[in-house]
């Protein structure tokens, strides 16, 4: 009996420009001989439902129809046909199929990739306009993917220690497009420091399918006319 | 920094097994195979097996088969050589080594050894 | 199994000049175009350490002084300049087939 196990939940997530391996195993009732046994794996994009060859693995020969893509054969004599693509792109996200050959039996197994860019984040102060004892600032959000993204704001005062999340005077840009498809968005968030206690910490926190946990960024009010520090001006928090 | 680190020195008696640790650190431990190759006193390599730690599949030499298992846990980047019904020309040096397998098969970085003797 | 002959067993350079170590394989360790010999040096009390992977790619970090060459049945590596901590036994492997083979070592040492 010949059988392939691919990932389990059948959906695999990749960081853009990583090199992944998609799992694929086989389960067979022998010894394999990778000599007499083929493995193909094909890619089907989420935008068009033509079906592409991407690597052949086939006795004393492999050929990969996209850069770098390969079958380790070390691997492949203990049961392991995954696929190694160096560099994984945006664009290449979609279904990916491992057909395994060991004649006369054929099995196949699919799996769904997903590739996400994770956010990075940097907070910028603009007082460009703004009336006395007012400012404003921006936390930036740039180079995520998928589009959907939440990002609110909290703040800690010393009276009260747990953050609160702050919903007036919050106003969130649309999410523009990058050249490269991952996209960018601006949150702004208006202060009045008369209004405010010295040493009450603003936090930036960013939501998104590529982060394990929240990205945050922080600044603090302080008594003097209030300002990012030179590091909070230029770091990039991600 | 890619680092691996094996459990101490062993002295056993003829028949015992002993089981060596070797603890990877620095680089994705499913992306690399993981060797065992030995060393008897002033003698050269052989190689033990390897053991893919992606979905645990293992290679041995024949010379071995039956009496060494390799086995890893995921969870703490760990390999682990056992060898069973041991004799007294097992005495070696025990090493594992991370193994590049897709592109070429070469062993890059080593981990320190374990020395094993057997004796009565 | 795939045996593997090095030769020579030893040799002792004077520092600043070149050195040469071949290992025949008793079948080809070629597959697909690729040459799967690799060749590792052990220090002494150390682990070995990988020089050159694929017959001819170098290691990164190792000097170029190092060089290796050959397909099939018939590989070199050559050191182009001895230096003091080139000392050590150099030992050839192929990968192509299972069991991993290791040539019997060859012992450099510094005149």
């Known amino acids: 009996d010949l059988k392939v196990e691919m990932m389990a939940g059948g959906t695999q997530i990749t960081p853009l420009n990583d090199n992944v391996t998609i799992f694929c195993n086989i389960f067979y009732s022998q010894p394999l001989n990778i000599t007499s046994m083929g493995i193909t794996w094909f890619w089907k994009s989420l935008t068009f439902d033509k079906e592409v060859k991407v690597f052949e693995f086939f006795g004393d020969h492999q050929e990969a129809f996209r850069p770098g893509a390969i079958v380790s054969p070390w691997r492949l004599k203990s049961g392991d046909a995954s696929l190694r693509l160096p560099g994984i792109q945006l664009e290449e996200a979609g279904e990916y199929r491992c057909e395994v050959v060991v004649t006369p039996l054929k099995a196949q197994g699919t799996v769904q990739l997903e590739v996400v860019a994770s956010p990075a984040s940097r907070l910028l102060l603009d007082q460009v306009g703004m009336k006395e004892n007012e400012d404003k600032y921006m936390c930036e959000s740039s180079g995520f993917y998928p589009e959907a993204i939440n990002i609110t704001w909290e703040k800690q005062t010393q009276k009260f220690p747990h953050p609160i999340e702050i919903s007036e005077d919050v106003i969130t840009g649309p999410t523009i497009k990058n050249m490269d498809g991952t996209f960018n968005v601006t949150s702004c968030l208006k202060l009045n420091s008369s209004q405010e206690d010295p040493g009450t910490v603003y936090q930036c926190v960013v939501r998104h399918a590529s982060l394990h946990t929240p990205l945050r960024s922080n600044f603090t009010l302080t008594a003097a006319r209030h300002s990012l520090s030179e590091t909070e001006k230029t770091d990039n928090f991600s | 920094e890619v680092q691996l680190v094996q459990s101490g020195a062993e002295v056993k008696k003829p028949g015992a097994s002993v089981k060596v640790s070797c603890k990877a650190s620095?680089?994705?431990?499913?992306?690399?195979?993981m060797d065992w190759v030995r060393q008897a006193p002033g003698k050269g390599l052989e190689w033990i097996g390897d053991?893919?730690?992606?979905?645990?599949?293992?290679l041995y030499n024949q010379k071995f088969r039956g009496r060494v298992t390799l086995t890893v846990d995921k969870s703490i980047s760990t390999a682990y050589m056992e060898l069973s019904r041991l004799r007294s020309d097992d005495t070696a040096v025990y090493y594992c080594?991370?193994?590049?397998?897709?592109?070429?098969?070469?062993?890059?970085?080593w981990g320190q050894g374990t020395t094993v003797t057997v004796s009565s | 199994d795939i045996v593997l002959t090095q030769t020579p067993l030893s040799l002792s350079v004077t520092p600043g000049q070149p050195a040469s170590i071949s290992c025949k394989a008793s079948?080809?360790?070629?597959?697909?175009?690729?040459?799967?010999m690799n060749w590792y040096l052990q220090k002494p009390g150390q682990p070995p350490q990988l020089l050159i992977y694929?017959?001819?790619t170098l290691h990164s970090g190792v000097p170029d002084r190092f060089s290796g060459s050959g397909s099939g049945t018939d590989f070199t590596l050559k050191i182009s300049r001895v230096e003091a901590e080139d000392v050590g036994v150099y030992y050839c492997?192929?990968?192509?087939?299972?069991?991993?083979?290791f040539g019997q070592g060859t012992k450099l040492e510094i005149k």
């Open positions: 080594a991370r193994s590049e397998v897709f592109y070429g098969n070469y062993a890059d970085y």
């Open positions: 620095g680089y994705t431990f499913t992306d690399y195979n």
């Open positions: 053991i893919n730690p992606n979905n645990g599949g293992t």
């Open positions: 079948q080809s360790v070629d597959y697909d175009g690729d040459s799967y």
């Open positions: 694929a017959a001819s």
């Open positions: 492997q192929q990968s192509k087939e299972d069991p991993r083979t």
